[in-house]
Amino acid sequence: MAVTACQGLGFVVSLIGIAGIIAATCMDQWSTQDLYNNPVTAVFNYQGLWRSCVRESSGFTECRGYFTLLGLPAMLQAVRALMIVGIVLGAIGLLVSIFALKCIRIGSMEDSAKANMTLTSGIMFIVSGLCAIAGVSVFANMLVTNFWMSTANMYTGMGGMVQTVQTRYTFGAALFVGWVAGGLTLIGGVMMCIACRGLAPEETNYKAVSYHASGHSVAYKPGGFKASTGFGSNTKNKKIYDGGARTEDEVQSYPSKHDYV
């Protein structure tokens, strides 16, 4: 039960995280610049990964996609790439994890297959979260190190004189959304990996022998009720009178101890 809960919770946490990564990638407020002290413009300027916007004191707002001819920082392209890779990996991870969920039965999928899929999706979520955290951190570092050198002209209200001052950039809301979302995706991935360990069937140290009584299709094996159900025996309609005992390795698929959780 604990395995199912861990897996389900990991899936939900990752889902929320990936939704957050998508939201952060689409948001316009990655960096903000307050120009209200500029008597010429009196505007609030903010930039995203795909476009930059300006909001005037009157309420008028306009956004425009980046013009490549104005030159975009190389780091911006790197951040875009990291966020997109994070989203793609996260989306694939979600798809895989849906089929890996223990509470969902798809055909006769074995627990070992579900465990492998859970581990795969967990790793994908971890990498996705790391990509998002890396992307947001690279952008934040770019703000801290580069933006104070911006050549934008600002005007001070002191007597109407024109003065070029350092442009003040601050972290936009998207950065915090991205950090939290990346963290959630990472946590969800770790939870999926933990759940995978519980899902994986433990290998026995002995070879169980299944005994067949002539004329019956029930395999008698050590292990009580679960072993005596005949689950997995004679799956390919083999003759059951082919020589008595067979090792468990020869039988196609036996139930694991987790089948009745």
Epitope: Q33, L35, V40, T41, A42, V43, N45, Q47, R51, S52, C53, V54, E56, S57, S58, F60, E62, C63, R64, G65, Y66, F67, L69, L70, L72, P73, L76, F147, S150, T151, A152, N153, T167
Partner: nanobody, 119 residues
Amino acid sequence: QVQLVESGGGLVQPGGSLRLSCAASGEISSDAMAWVRQAPGKGLEWVAGMTRGGSTNYADSVKGRFTISRDNSKNTLYLQMNSLRAEDTAVYYCNAEIYTGTFYPRSYWGQGTLVTVSS
């Protein structure tokens, strides 16, 4: 990316009027435009500004006498100067600022047009 060409300057008597024009050319229209002047032997002084949304602002020294306007279809900024005084004598520069469509805000300047107020 943005070229600014001012025109309309000249010699005018005190109390007279002049209309300055600033034609902006380029593939990107500006988000804010302004007129800035520099009197002989002095520093730059901001005169008036206008945003794409239509918000206007004026320096106290020109309020009530100067009017800034913008024709977005022609991509041109105007400065109507009335009741001119001798202290308005200066080289008037056009300034355009771009915030949208660029990651770093950009500022562009024209070459200036001389306005002389003298009797």
